[in-house]
């Protein structure tokens, strides 16, 4: 099931920024999702549940995000122009067991500015 998650559109563009979507199986209840830019952790989101099923979300790097029952989307508004970067979603599954760590989708994002117009953004899987 995890292997199927790479086949989705990882990057989309809006409001001059980049949305990076990291998908995971709907059965996952508690998780950590990390977004790597090259080898650097850019975003780190953890979702856990307590004994009363209350959800706790920790976002220590303060990345703008959107969480659904099968994806985490991170929003980047300061992507460097004229410089390509490789982005990778890394998933740790706490629940249900067994504990698993998986590198999910990855893609190369190149942003460059046209002298005539606007930023053009290309991504390669």
């Amino acid at each position: 099931e995890l292997n199927d998650l790479a086949n989705h559109r990882m990057f989309s563009f809006h409001d001059g920024g980049v949305q990076i979507s990291c998908n995971y199986p709907e059965t996952v209840q508690q998780l950590k999702m990390q977004l790597f830019k090259d080898r650097e952790v850019l975003c780190d989101l953890t979702k856990t549940k307590g004994s009363g099923n209350t959800v706790s979300i920790k976002n220590p790097m303060s990345c703008p995000y959107q969480l659904s029952n099968n994806s985490v989307s991170f929003f980047l508004d300061n992507a460097d122009s004229s410089q390509g970067s490789y982005f990778l979603c890394s998933l740790s599954i706490f629940d249900p067991p067994p504990f698993q760590e998986k590198n999910l989708s990855g893609g190369y994002l190149l942003i460059y500015e046209s002298q005539l117009c606007c930023q053009l953004k290309l991504w390669l899987p």
């Epitope: 549940k49 004994s51 009363g52 099923n53 706790s56 920790k58």
Partner: antibody
Framework: EVQLVESGGGLVQPGGSLRLSCAAS????????MDWVRQAPGKGLVWVSN????????EYSPFVKGRFTISRDNAKNTLYLQMNSLRAEDTAVYYC??????????WGQGTLVTVSS | DIVMTQSPDSLAVSLGERATINCKSS??????????LTWYQQKPGQPPKLLIF???TRHTGVPDRFSGSGSGTDFTLTISSLQAEDVAVYYC?????????FGPGTKVDIK
């Protein structure tokens, strides 16, 4: 090896206060929700309170809400339970427990709190 | 609050025989594909120990003579072949919502 060691129990008069502590070791304390569960002598288990990984979420049993306060110090790997306005019915062994994502997977040996005049 | 009930209150079973404990919740504990029900064993003078989570998954190190079953509001803990070291009180517990609650316990003895 996960270890949870409670302290701070004892005899207290009705209306009095006590502060329980739980020293945790053998795991990354700041990665886990933690709970207090109590057991009156010869009786069953009753959940008391919980706290999330950094202390920003706390929940309480209706029996203790407004009287007990749970807190944690992740730098000291310690969980606390401040108990005020104690009543005779609060007499119990208080267990510190780790919420291991889908169950209480580690328990301390417990500390006895006796509320009596 | 969800109320958990257990039956019987106590039972005595011969060594090697099957012991069955029932647990009922006042509302369904099923959410998605998960039943938010756990079982604990408490031996005399000891803290409780996690046996089964999500109604049917054995915790690490728990012998396979222990099994859990059921869904929704009705659950069962079965000890397929009772051993002397299984003498204990067994509690069911839900974590479907707050506050989580325990059943009153079932005491298991040797006949």
């Amino acid at each position: 090896e996960v270890q949870l060691v409670e302290s701070g129990g004892g005899l207290v008069q009705p209306g009095g206060s006590l502060r329980l502590s739980c020293a945790a070791s053998g795991f990354t304390f700041s990665d886990y929700w933690m709970d207090w569960v109590r057991q009156a002598p010869g009786k069953g288990l009753v959940w008391v309170s919980n706290i999330d990984e950094d202390g920003s979420i706390t929940e309480y049993s209706p029996f203790v809400k407004g009287r007990f306060t749970i807190s944690r110090d992740n730098a000291k790997n310690t969980l606390y339970l401040q108990m005020n306005s104690l009543r005779a019915e609060d007499t119990a062994v208080y267990y510190c427990t780790r919420w291991g994502r889908f169950g209480f997977d580690s328990w301390g040996q417990g500390t006895l709190v006796t509320v009596s005049s | 609050d969800i109320v958990m009930t257990q039956s019987p209150d106590s039972l005595a079973v011969s060594l090697g025989e099957r012991a069955t404990i029932n647990c009922k919740s006042s509302q369904s504990l099923l959410s998605g594909s998960f039943n938010y029900l756990t079982w604990y064993q408490q031996k005399p003078g000891q803290p409780p120990k996690l046996l089964i989570f999500y109604a049917s998954t054995r915790h690490t190190g728990v012998p396979d003579r222990f099994s859990g079953s059921g869904s929704g509001t009705d659950f069962t803990l079965t000890i397929s072949s009772l051993q002397a070291e299984d003498v204990a009180v067994y509690y069911c517990h839900h974590h479907y919502n707050a506050p989580p609650t325990f059943g009153p316990g079932t005491k298991v003895d040797i006949k």
